[in-house]
Amino acid sequence: EPPTACREKQYLINSQCCSLCQPGQKLVSDCTEFTETECLPCGESEFLDTWNRETHCHQHKYCDPNLGLRVQQKGTSETDTICTCEEGWHCTSEACESCVLHRSCSPGFGVKQIATGVSDTICEPCPVGFFSNVSSAFEKCHPWTSCETKDLVVQQAGTNKTDVVCGPQDRLR
């Protein structure tokens, strides 16, 4: 009696179970009563990443430098190429099909989390006691200076964008 279901890594065709092609190979011809499934390795720049009965391998992803992409991991016959973004850029999606420039944190804000190839810079406002006077994708807020530690006195208080200004002790008011 012909089978209605096949084992793992097999497929049903013409009332018989044939072996699937292993990852990295494509199907050339189905098995018969007398012959095994015929498979062929994927060509250069092609891959198949599962046990399959595909007659065509997939093309490796192209990391287009015009979109800010570069190869993070070269593809094999069993794996696709993995793209990432050039330094200073991050992917616009999980699939990393294009890149955008990392955001900079404006004065008054510091970097909470530095951007990666897949996530943008996360900024946070500098709280009272801290400042940032630059636009930066790397700098955290800096603490205000304590003038006393330098044997000076405060002449002007800090803001979220400026440090405290210190001056000599004998300053006339």
Partner: antibody, heavy 121, light 113 residues
């Protein structure tokens, strides 16, 4: 110990100005912010602004710019707040409080007893 | 401006009961650079000045009884009085000191049944 002593209650006419004082003792007056807070019945607490006596630097709540002016005299350890062009909306109790160190920030840990200002014609 | 919202606006409790009040901020008060929450709690008894109870969201001010506990992080904070005493009759305010202008919550009035 740290103490903040405020001036007494004031009864003022609309359009007039009033100057409230806050004398600090028991700590280095110049290096801590002096905060000013308004309290009207049923209105909770409202931050007016602050002055750093050592430098004269100030931060104002936008809602009080042009209404409140802060000054400080380090020789007498006294901070002042002047309120101008008084209206009935300015009738309230005004508190001074010690804020954080100038290079650190922080909560208001000592408070004056409050100065009641009543504006009435 | 950072908006501070307190709830409930008032509550009546019996002596010995546990009291919990909430304070929410419109933006995070946690600064990643020092892992501090820029939030304070104050107690104001009738006819008196406010008194600092808790700073950095959870640190009890010197001399404050240990029945008062501050907790929470980011935008959600809680003040708990583990076993209320008659002398705790007051209005409790939260305040953020993360950024200017400093802002207070509307207060929670604790009444004794």
């Amino acid at each position: 110990q740290v103490q903040l002593q405020q001036s007494g209650a004031e009864l003022m006419k609309p359009g007039a100005s009033v100057k409230i004082s806050c004398k600090a003792t028991g700590y280095t007056f110049s290096t801590y912010w002096i905060e000013w807070v308004k309290q009207r019945p049923g209105h909770g607490l409202e931050w007016i602004g602050e002055i750093l006596p050592g430098s004269g630097s100030t931060n104002y709540n936008e809602n009080f710019k042009g209404k409140a002016t802060f000054t400080a005299d380090t020789s007498s350890n006294t901070a002042y707040m002047q309120l101008s062009s008084l209206t009935s909306e300015d009738s309230a109790v005004y508190f001074c409080a010690r804020g954080g160190l100038y290079y650190y920030g922080g909560a208001m840990d000592y408070w004056g007893q409050g100065t009641s200002v009543t504006v009435s014609s | 401006d950072i908006v501070m919202s307190q709830s409930p606006s008032s509550l009546a409790v019996s002596v010995g009961e546990k009291v919990t009040m909430s304070c929410k901020s419109s933006q995070s008060l946690l600064y990643s650079g020092n892992q501090k929450n820029y939030l304070a709690w104050y107690q104001q008894k009738p006819g008196q000045s406010p008194k600092l109870l808790i700073y950095w969201a959870s640190i009890r001010e010197s001399g404050v009884p240990d029945r008062f506990t501050g907790s929470g992080s980011g935008t959600d904070f809680t003040l708990t009085i583990s076993s209320v005493k008659a002398e705790d009759l007051a209005v409790y305010y939260c305040q953020q000191y993360y950024s200017y202008p400093y802002t207070f919550g509307g207060g929670t009035k604790v009444e004794i049944k």
